[in-house]
């Protein structure tokens, strides 16, 4: 038995926990084992998050915003674990949490700073607006405000337009770049410094191909090793631009190794796919096949866009018939 007059002064410990929007997190807190454990978690020193004492939860005074979202590790309390399991964090949950733990021999208070980040997978889009061509890097929901950088042929570009809309809890950001008439390669990087997460979009324009009607065309699409990790889930989409909009020819999902082909003349080489080569063949070309072909390899961490321009010309036979 310890004397109850024995009070141990423990300085305020402060930890930082980084959570992701809508995901579950743990706010850590530990203490020296003792009898009569009391645990009170509070937010910003005002709102009751969770209370436990006399062997059970006491949530009568819990702030409604935490209802059904908090629990302790009940089997580990006797081992000195007062950590809080926190479900579905939102940006409104950001702030300072204080864990008060009392036992018959001491009382300690731990502070945990919760920061919440959002990074819905960005996208890189290629768009035609009248006679102009644009690359657009966009992220639908991100917090805090990200760092966006563009490079042309691996050289940073200072021009960096950002169209930003702020909702209650995050930003939606578009960063367009006019690439009209350019044959350069472009790279866009979006970085969330809080979540230490970076996404890269890379755009490469291949030399134009001239083909005759009824011939077939081979269009290359191989990921750049710097970004590509075959262990990570990714999707490959081949599409063709017609009158300003892209129609999907085929796509491949690495998770299921499924290939879906919407154009009967399109073919993929399974063996090449296994070697991470997503080059495609389009058979029996006709004049309406002229246009831009886009290969999009996308994962959570990157988008690699490769664009081919194909010109299909009438064969001599067809020309002489006309």
């Amino acid at each position: 038995i310890f004397p109850l007059a024995f009070f141990i002064y423990v300085p305020m410990n402060e930890q930082i926990v980084i959570g992701r929007l809508d995901e579950d997190i743990i706010l850590p807190s530990s203490f020296e084992r003792g009898s009569e454990v009391v645990i009170h978690w509070k937010y910003q020193d005002s709102y009751k998050v969770h209370s436990y004492y006399k062997g059970s939860d006491h949530l009568e005074s819990q702030d409604p915003r935490y209802a059904n979202r908090t629990s302790l590790f009940y089997n580990e309390i006797q081992n000195g674990n007062a950590s809080l399991f926190f479900r579905r964090v939102s940006l409104l949950d950001e702030g300072i949490y204080t864990c008060y733990v009392g036992t018959a021999i001491q009382v300690i208070t731990n502070k945990v700073v919760l920061k919440v980040g959002v990074f819905l997978t960005p996208v890189m889009k290629y768009e035609k607006r009248n006679t102009n061509s644009f690359l657009i890097c966009s992220v639908l929901s991100v917090y805090p405000r990200p760092i966006i950088t563009w490079k042309m042929d691996n050289t940073p570009i200072s021009e960096n337009n950002m169209e930003e809309t702020g909702s209650l809890d995050s930003f939606s950001i578009n960063s367009p770049l006019n690439i009209t008439g350019s044959n350069s390669s472009y790279e866009c990087t979006i970085e969330n410094s809080l979540l230490k997460q970076t996404w890269t979009g890379r755009w490469t324009m291949k030399d134009g191909l001239h083909k005759m009607q009824s011939e077939h065309v081979s269009l290359s699409c191989q990921p750049v090793n710097d970004y590509f990790s075959p262990n990570q889930d990714f999707k490959v989409t081949w599409s063709r631009m017609k009158s300003g909009t892209f129609s999907v020819l085929a796509y491949y999902l690495s998770s299921s190794q499924n290939t879906i082909i919407n154009e009967s003349r399109f073919s993929w080489n399974k063996e090449l796919i296994n070697q991470s080569d997503f080059s495609m063949n389009l058979m029996d070309l006709n004049l309406s096949d002229s246009g831009e072909y886009l290969c999009n390899i996308s994962s959570d961490e990157y988008t690699l866009l490769t664009i081919h321009t194909v010109h299909v010309e009438p064969s001599q036979e067809t020309a002489s018939h006309n």
Epitope: E36, K54, Y100
Partner: antibody, heavy 120, light 107 residues
């Protein structure tokens, strides 16, 4: 060591008010719940009120509910009992007492008490 | 609210006697019961908490038992310095009511 010193007691007429104070030292006051307990001289102990370590929860005996208010100032290490509408039956020695932990347990340290006499 | 009763209200015993005091709660309170000793002219002192755990510095002749509604404080061998009034107190939830007390003196 834990020290609790009550003050503010005295003689007061029925219906009047009185405010008791309790100065705490020798422990981290803001970490512990605090109680007021009273005792009519020669009689038994009567629990009066409790306040949690952070002041967020308070509870009272039915006999004082609505008339007495317990409060604390953690920056001053002081506990208070505001007593309004005093009655003759409130005459007692009032003890300030420290809770084992946050304000939900038993008393492990007591002050010496201050006498409140309600008399016309 | 839960009521606390104690019996007997007073007792006289000889030095060396075994003394037993009973405390009863009107509803179950698990083991959330404390015992206090108050000597004449002094402030109360914690003897036992959690129904049976001896507070540090309290002589081992004091012991507590019970759970739910019925609790007992036992002094295995009464000493002259044990002359006092003994109170039980429930602390399962507010109000933290005291029993009326048992006065113990020496024959």
């Amino acid at each position: 060591q834990v020290q609790l010193v009550e003050s503010g007691g005295g003689v007061v007429q029925p219906g009047r008010s009185l405010r008791l104070s309790c100065a705490a030292s020798g422990f981290t006051f803001s970490n512990y719940g605090m109680h007021w307990v009273r005792q009519v001289p020669g009689k038994g102990l009567e629990w009066v009120a409790v306040i949690w370590y952070d002041g967020s929860e308070k509870d009272y005996a039915d006999s004082v509910k609505g008339r007495f208010t317990i409060s604390r100032d953690n920056s001053k290490n002081t506990l208070y009992l505001q007593m309004n509408s005093l009655r003759v039956e409130d005459t007692a020695v009032y003890y300030c007492a420290k809770d084992l932990i946050s304000g939900i347990y038993y008393v492990d340290h007591w002050g010496q008490g201050t006498l409140v006499t309600v008399s016309s | 609210d839960i009521q606390m009763t104690q019996s007997p209200s007073s007792l006289s015993a000889s030095v060396g006697d075994r003394v037993t005091i009973t405390c009863r709660a009107s509803q179950g309170i698990s083991n959330y019961l404390a015992w206090y000793q108050q000597k004449p002219g002094k402030v109360p002192k914690l003897l036992i908490y959690a129904a049976s755990t001896l507070q540090s510095g309290v002589p081992s002749r004091f012991s507590g038992s019970g759970s739910g509604t019925d609790f007992t404080l036992t002094i295995s061998s009464l000493q002259p310095e044990d002359v006092a009034t003994y109170y039980c107190q429930k602390y399962n939830a507010a109000p933290f009511t005291f029993g009326p007390g048992t006065k113990v003196d020496i024959k």
